[in-house]
């Protein structure tokens, strides 16, 4: 029957007995980063070139035995999970193998940046189909190490990697913590975060998604017909490098961007118990494990969107923290969080000619978040309408005033302390949905865009008592653009997007008391692309 | 029903060709390898070969290298195996197997095909 | 290539006796990163295609009778027949799968004492 890890990345319509995708990677090469290798095994054989390619240090203690069969190990069993004939996960993609990892599983970050340097000349003397580059190691956090993937990345390389089995959070680690990089944390049968001993799988902001990575069934490089299990988020990575050979091979002109929202998408969604995480970062997690797309085809039409959160601003008092959108993606809005609720907003601004969200700390608060909404939205043209704190004691509003403009998200900053201590909450004027509203002392940001076919509309959800958490989702074909709270009264700790879901948080009920100071509304923007729909239809 | 049917019997001439075929069916052929077994008569099991009808990457035993040539067509679960050139010593039962990766064995056998060469 | 030697060549139990069939290979086919011997043990009966009835030296396959044991490690392994039947009269094979070229013994005959 199927193994465990590749009847999970099968979307249910092609659920059978055996693994059978619809489309095996074969106009991919994947390259991976690794041991040594056992290329006849039979798993692999014709599948895997070795590439002359090796820098490896030596191996530690003088009592040291290289025996062939444990230099393969790793590198042998991760080719087949990307690969293999009979347990891989894309069954046509090629690989090219790099040996920067020695007999004990040790490389140096010198070893990994020539052969990233080496893959990217390859590329240059002999251009071919799409690349996926696989990095199923992990050391310490190297700016050096993330500015190579970057450059990787940019030249149109996919590049995956394993999030670490630290148990600790993957951004002081790389490459798993370089943004332009795929970072992958491994999850069991169970759909439980991989507990490896007394570690585990990294989690985090720096990590984009969860795939298989305990008791994996793949090649032992012990014989040419052996198979072990092997865990760790190496085979978690190496299952979405063969699932994003297989979107690439379906698609070959999708850029890393697509890709990213697309192994986004299509993943389960709310499967992983996050109360293995520590508490701090389970709101900074994403809850997703990889699967394969229902169809390799006809994901077009849909407006794709992702949340970033940025790194903790710290607590100083005039702190900032920022989120940004890769390359390709736009700022659709930008929202804060705190979670001791002293915060004074954020606010959409440029930098470098693209916008980022910046979030900033108050007076006596623990730090801030900025969370992004990146989004892909071909030909959009998006700019921020900022009010100025209003003297009318109706508050501040902002609308999108541009002919063909939509709101797409509303963000709100203020810069005296606790702003809305003791305020009455601030109430949106009827019939006027597409603006957005907030206290007179604070500046509000319209994030307003133009896009072929982009319609968008306003959500709320609004409680009346207080309560820890409101959400208020975006209905099917729809996707979620802005997510914000109204009124920003101080026990609002921010507002942030969870897939299609906009979630606001507030303080502890019991804190607040139950005057109408605990009255909040989530506020959710939802968008689809007519456009987009209609170019897809054309395609078909 | 998970079964290998292999075609009938030969009798052939030594010097000419032949093919035989095995139809897999109650399972995804594709994903399974097949492997062909030679039993001369009153004699044992000798693996000749193996096909990986998915990609058609074989792998044959160092006896029968250059000798056969084994093949598939995933379109219609069929693996055959062939000679350009028989002889008498071709003579015997040739049986094609279901080769279960995890345990890369053979836990389905088809009937067999008695090929006989003589002049 | 490795090597599977089968003893005895042929073997004459009465019903209902211990039938003991002994295979070694010329290499181990134990393998330390799952533990496991990769080898099977198969049954063939006249004018039949043989039947899987072992495999990782120990492990029955599904629908075969428990009077079928195997046991082993390493390069040395035993077919048992705890109790002979008739029906078990049959031509056994070992097989080695740890590496091609995927070998077999030559055989041992078990027939009726």
């Known amino acids: 029957s199927i193994p465990w890890n590749l009847e999970r990345i099968t979307p249910p319509r092609y659920r059978a007995d055996e693994y059978q995708p619809p489309d095996g990677g074969s106009l991919v090469e994947v390259y991976l980063l690794d041991t040594s290798i056992q290329s006849d095994h039979r798993e692999i054989e014709g599948r895997v070139m070795v590439t002359d390619f090796e820098n490896v240090p030596e191996e530690d203690g003088t009592r040291f035995h290289r025996q062939a069969s444990k230099c393969d190990s790793h590198g042998t069993h991760l080719a087949g999970v990307v690969s293999g004939r009979d347990a891989g996960v894309a069954k046509g993609a090629s690989m090219r193998s790099l040996r920067v990892l020695n007999c004990q599983g040790k490389g140096t970050v010198s070893g990994t940046l020539i052969g990233l340097e080496f893959i990217r000349k390859s590329q240059l003397v002999q251009p071919v189909g799409p690349l996926v580059v696989l990095l199923p190691l992990a050391g310490g956090y190297s700016r050096v190490l993330n500015a190579a993937c970057q450059r990787l990345a940019r030249a149109g390389v996919v590049l995956v990697t394993a999030a670490g089995n630290f148990r600790d959070d993957a951004c002081l680690y790389s490459p798993a913590s370089a943004p332009e990089v795929i970072t992958v944390g491994a999850t069991n049968a169970q759909d439980q975060p991989v507990t490896l001993g007394t570690l585990g799988t990294n989690f985090g902001r720096c990590v984009d998604l969860f795939a298989p990575g305990e008791d994996i069934i793949g090649a032992s490089s012990d014989c040419s017909t052996c198979f072990v299990s092997q865990s760790g988020t190496s085979q978690a990575a190496a299952h979405v490098a063969g699932i994003a050979a297989m979107m690439l091979s379906a698609e070959p002109e999708l850029t890393l961007a697509e890709l990213r929202q697309r192994l986004i998408h299509f993943s389960a969604k709310d499967v992983i118990n996050e109360a293995w995480f520590p508490e701090d970062q389970r709101v900074l997690t994403p809850n997703l494990v990889a699967a394969l797309p229902p169809s390799t085809h006809g994901a077009g039409w849909q407006l794709f969107c992702r949340t970033v959160w940025s790194a903790h601003s710290g607590p100083t008092r005039m702190a900032t923290a920022v989120a940004r959108c890769a390359p390709d993606e736009e700022l659709l809005s930008c929202s804060s969080f705190s979670r001791s609720g002293k915060r004074r907003g954020e606010r959409m601004e440029a930098q470098g000619g693209k916008l980022v969200c910046r979030a900033h700390n108050a007076f006596g608060g623990e730090g801030v978040y900025a969370i992004a909404r990146c989004c892909l939205l071909p030909q959009a043209n998006c700019s921020v309408h900022t009010a100025p704190p209003a003297e009318a004691s109706m508050g501040t509003r902002v609308h999108c005033h541009q002919q063909g403009h939509v709101l797409t998200g509303c963000s709100s900053h203020w810069e005296v302390e606790d702003l809305g201590t003791h305020k009455p909450p601030v109430l949106r004027p009827r019939g006027q949905p597409n603006q957005c509203v907030g206290h007179r002392e604070a500046s509000i940001h319209a994030s307003c865009c133009h896009a072929p076919g982009l319609e968008c509309k306003v959500k709320e959800h609004g409680i009346p008592a207080p309560q820890e958490q409101v959400t208020v989702a975006c209905e099917e074909g729809w996707t979620l653009t802005g997510c914000s709270a109204l009124p920003g009264t101080s026990h609002v700790l921010g507002a942030y997007a969870v897939d299609n879901t906009c979630v606001v948080r507030s303080r502890d009920v019991s804190t607040t008391g139950s005057t109408s100071e605990g009255a909040v509304t989530a506020v959710a923007i939802c968008c689809r692309s007519r456009h987009l729909a209609q170019a897809s239809q054309e395609l078909q | 029903q998970v079964q290998l049917v292999q075609s009938g019997a030969e009798v052939k001439k030594p010097g000419e060709s032949l093919k035989i075929s095995c139809k897999g069916s109650g399972y995804s052929f594709t994903n399974y390898w097949i492997s062909w077994v030679r039993q001369m008569p009153g004699k044992g099991l000798e693996w000749m070969g193996i096909?990986?009808?998915?990609?058609?990457?074989?792998k044959y035993s160092p006896s029968f290298q250059g000798q056969v040539t084994i093949s598939a067509d995933k379109s219609i679960s069929t693996a055959y195996l062939q000679w350009s050139s028989l002889k008498a010593s071709d003579t015997a039962m040739y049986y094609c197997a279901r080769d279960y990766w995890y345990k890369p064995l053979f836990d389905i056998w088809g009937q067999g095909t008695l090929v006989t060469v003589s002049s | 290539d490795i090597v599977m030697t089968q003893s005895p060549d042929s073997l004459a139990v009465s019903l209902g006796e211990r039938a003991t069939i002994n295979c070694r290979s010329s290499?181990?086919?134990?393998?330390?990163?799952?533990?496991?011997?990769?080898l099977a043990w198969y049954q063939q009966k006249p004018g039949q295609p043989p039947k899987l009835l072992i495999y990782w030296a120990s492990t029955r396959e599904s629908g075969v009778p428990d009077r079928f044991s195997g046991s082993g490690s390493g390069t040395d392994f035993t077919l048992t027949i705890s109790s002979l039947q008739a029906e078990d009269v049959a031509v056994y094979y070992c097989q080695q799968y740890s590496s091609f070229p995927i070998t077999f013994g030559q055989g041992t005959k078990v027939e009726i004492k």
């Open positions: 290499q181990s086919v134990l393998y330390s990163s799952n533990n496991k011997n990769y």
């Open positions: 096909i990986y009808p998915g990609d058609s990457y074989t």
